[in-house]
């Protein structure tokens, strides 16, 4: 049966890195430059991915595998196989339609990507603000006022003058 199949379809003998050339009596021809075939028995070779602009080559194309791209410094990959590059922002910023913008008051972003997120509302958990939030950092919630009764904790309670989540001016 294997011999019969080979007689019927000579292309099945063409290994990865080649294609079955109909113009040359279906003999196996090497993939042309800048193309590849990752499996055997292929009738065409695929064009290699080109990493251009903000994309840079992470792995060169070979006759049997496609090129792989990543992003130039200042950008990070999005999508399967790094199909997109998104500009980094600084911590404390987010990418908007007008480029990188500082997080609004009451929000933070501790990464170079993603969106600004609201500070934790400590009072929802019955806790108090131990460390105020900034554009780059979330607030740190401390023990609840009840936990701060004498002898219950060694943590110094925060100064009472600020509302929860407010960063110092």
């Amino acid at each position: 049966f294997e011999r019969t199949r080979s007689l019927q379809d000579p292309c099945s003998n063409c290994p990865a890195g080649t294609f079955c050339d109909n113009n040359r009596n279906q003999i196996c021809s090497p993939c042309p430059p800048n193309s590849f075939s990752s499996a055997g028995g292929q009738r065409t070779c695929d064009i290699c991915r080109q990493c251009k602009g903000v994309f840079r080559t992470r792995k060169e194309c070979s006759s049997t595998s496609n090129a792989e791209c990543d992003c130039t410094p200042g950008f990070h990959c999005l999508g399967a196989g790094c199909s997109m590059c998104e500009q980094d922002c600084k911590q404390g910023q987010e990418l908007t339609k007008k480029g990188c913008k500082d997080c609004c008051f009451g929000t933070f972003n501790d990464q170079k990507r993603g969106i600004c997120r609201p500070w934790t509302n400590c009072s929802l958990d019955g806790k108090s603000v131990l460390v105020n939030g900034t554009k780059e950092r979330d607030v740190v919630c401390g023990p609840s006022p009840a936990d701060l009764s004498p002898g219950a904790s060694s943590v110094t309670p925060p100064a009472p003058a600020r509302e929860p989540g407010h960063s110092p001016q």
Partner: nanobody
Framework: EVQLVESGGGLIQPGGSLRLSCAAS????????MSWARQAPGKGFEWVSS???????YYVESVKGRFTISRDNSKNTLYLQMNSLRAEDTAVYYC????????????????WGQGTLVTVSS
Amino acid sequence: EVQLVESGGGLIQPGGSLRLSCAASGFTFSSSAMSWARQAPGKGFEWVSSIYSSGKTYYVESVKGRFTISRDNSKNTLYLQMNSLRAEDTAVYYCARWKTLRVGVWDESDYWGQGTLVTVSS
């Protein structure tokens, strides 16, 4: 074959003006959003400005009020008018077909030109 060819770069004194052009061919320019990006010496790419097929424009904060992006669909050409140039505008400027329509985000299928160097120095 898709081609984007930038021109108009050069040496200019601070405060001066330049107009960059990008001649496009091999794709439907009029229905494509386009962008300018730049790469300063030894630094990463930075998105500069984008224009939708509708003509709506966006700019990075640092060039707003100084740079103007425009397009002439009859000539398949993208422009970047740069006024009040500063030393920090020194970079290679690239035009690109912009598929994602998301500021600061590029797609692997976007087309890029080879770039034109703008040097702002006295």
